[in-house]
């Protein structure tokens, strides 16, 4: 089979601070040195790009400065963290991996991680 398999957890619960982390692992059919990782969000059949980063194997992932994502890589694993999440951001977060260089190009898309975000209750006013 030539297609690249991408694995990611089925469900993740964001922290009370709106941070969610998950691992995206890909079974590389080739010896890639340049990899692009994109996080897609699917909600109500609409798909949007959350963030994307291209990295050289062994180096850190570099997202844009205003990105809500950060990440680290280790071999064929990418540890992704999405921050600033609110309840309305609950949805299916899909990891898309592309082996960009050297040729040949390969594509792998995970089944998605359902991220649940619960907005924290506001602290009650205290008289003390």
């Amino acid at each position: 089979c030539k297609a690249m398999h991408v694995a990611q957890p089925a469900v993740v619960l964001a922290s009370s601070r709106g941070i969610a982390s998950f691992v995206c692992e890909y079974a590389s059919p080739g010896k890639a040195t340049e990899v692009r990782v994109t996080v897609l969000r699917q909600a109500d059949s609409q798909v949007t790009e959350v963030c994307a980063a291209t990295y050289m194997m062994g180096n850190e992932l570099t997202f844009l400065d205003d990105s809500i994502c950060t990440g680290t890589s280790s071999g064929n694993q990418v540890n992704l963290t999405i921050q600033g999440l609110r309840a309305m951001d609950t949805g299916l977060y899909i990891c898309k991996v592309e082996l960009m260089y050297p040729p040949p190009y390969y594509l792998g898309i995970g089944n998605g991680t359902q991220i649940y975000v619960i907005d924290p209750e506001p602290c009650p006013d205290s008289d003390f």
Partner: antibody, heavy 118, light 107 residues
């Protein structure tokens, strides 16, 4: 709206050159891979070339490798296909197409006709 | 490179008929398969991606199925406006290969 518009086609003699352009509007050009696909008379669709994201990675079909060069100008939201050493078998309608978020070709231009004939 | 083989190369059916087009990949491509419709003199249009997901705005009479090497495009009730050539395409790896096309006509 999201749109791709090709230009630059025409009639050219074998061995000569031509440059096709593809102007993109309505989406973040640098977030997508853009492909060239052609349809020769009486034939099926044939993938020609792709340029990715920031333009650092390009791939070509074996049939055009070494003769065609794909490039992009992000400041102009425009894709180019420089076609050198043209042959009769390069005669086709050339389309640019966007690789969508799922990587299938979701947006296509209207196409531009290239005819290589002496 | 992966080869995509479509069958039949052409077919003629009556309005309202159920039409099935098959596509076989020479190697496993998971579900990285798209179907396109190209009407005579028109631009190709994405119908289905990820083997079975209908592109927004495409009529529900079109459906796709399959995974691995064998895929199917089905038109549940053929309409006059469906006269076109249909192409499958794999996008799991370079080069991005199309099937040779299936020409659909009305009897």
């Amino acid at each position: 709206q999201v749109q791709l518009v090709e230009s630059g086609g025409g009639v050219v003699q074998p061995g000569r050159s031509l440059r096709l352009s593809c102007a993109a509007t309505g989406f973040n050009f640098s977030s997508y891979g853009i492909h060239w696909v052609r349809l020769a008379p009486g034939k099926g669709l044939e993938w020609v070339a792709v340029i990715w994201y920031d333009g650092s990675n390009r791939y070509y079909a074996d049939s055009v490798k070494g003769r065609f060069t794909i490039s992009r100008d992000t400041s102009k939201n425009t894709l180019y296909l420089q076609m050198n050493s043209l042959r009769a078998e390069d005669t086709a309608v050339y389309y640019c197409a966007r690789a969508g978020l799922w990587s299938a070709f979701d947006i296509w231009g209207r196409g531009t006709m290239v005819s290589v004939s002496s | 490179d992966i080869q995509m083989t479509q069958s039949p190369s052409s077919l003629s059916a009556s309005v309202g008929d159920r039409v099935t087009i098959t596509c076989r990949a020479s190697q496993g491509i998971s579900n990285y398969l798209a179907w396109y419709q190209q009407k005579p003199g028109k631009v190709p249009k994405l119908l289905i991606y990820a083997a079975s997901t209908l592109q927004s705005g495409v009529p529900s009479r079109f459906s796709g199925s399959g995974s691995g090497t064998d895929f199917t495009l089905t038109i549940s009730s053929l309409q006059p406006e469906d006269v076109a050539t249909y192409y499958c395409q794999e996008y799991s790896s370079a080069p991005w290969t199309f099937g040779q096309g299936t020409k659909v006509e009305i009897k």
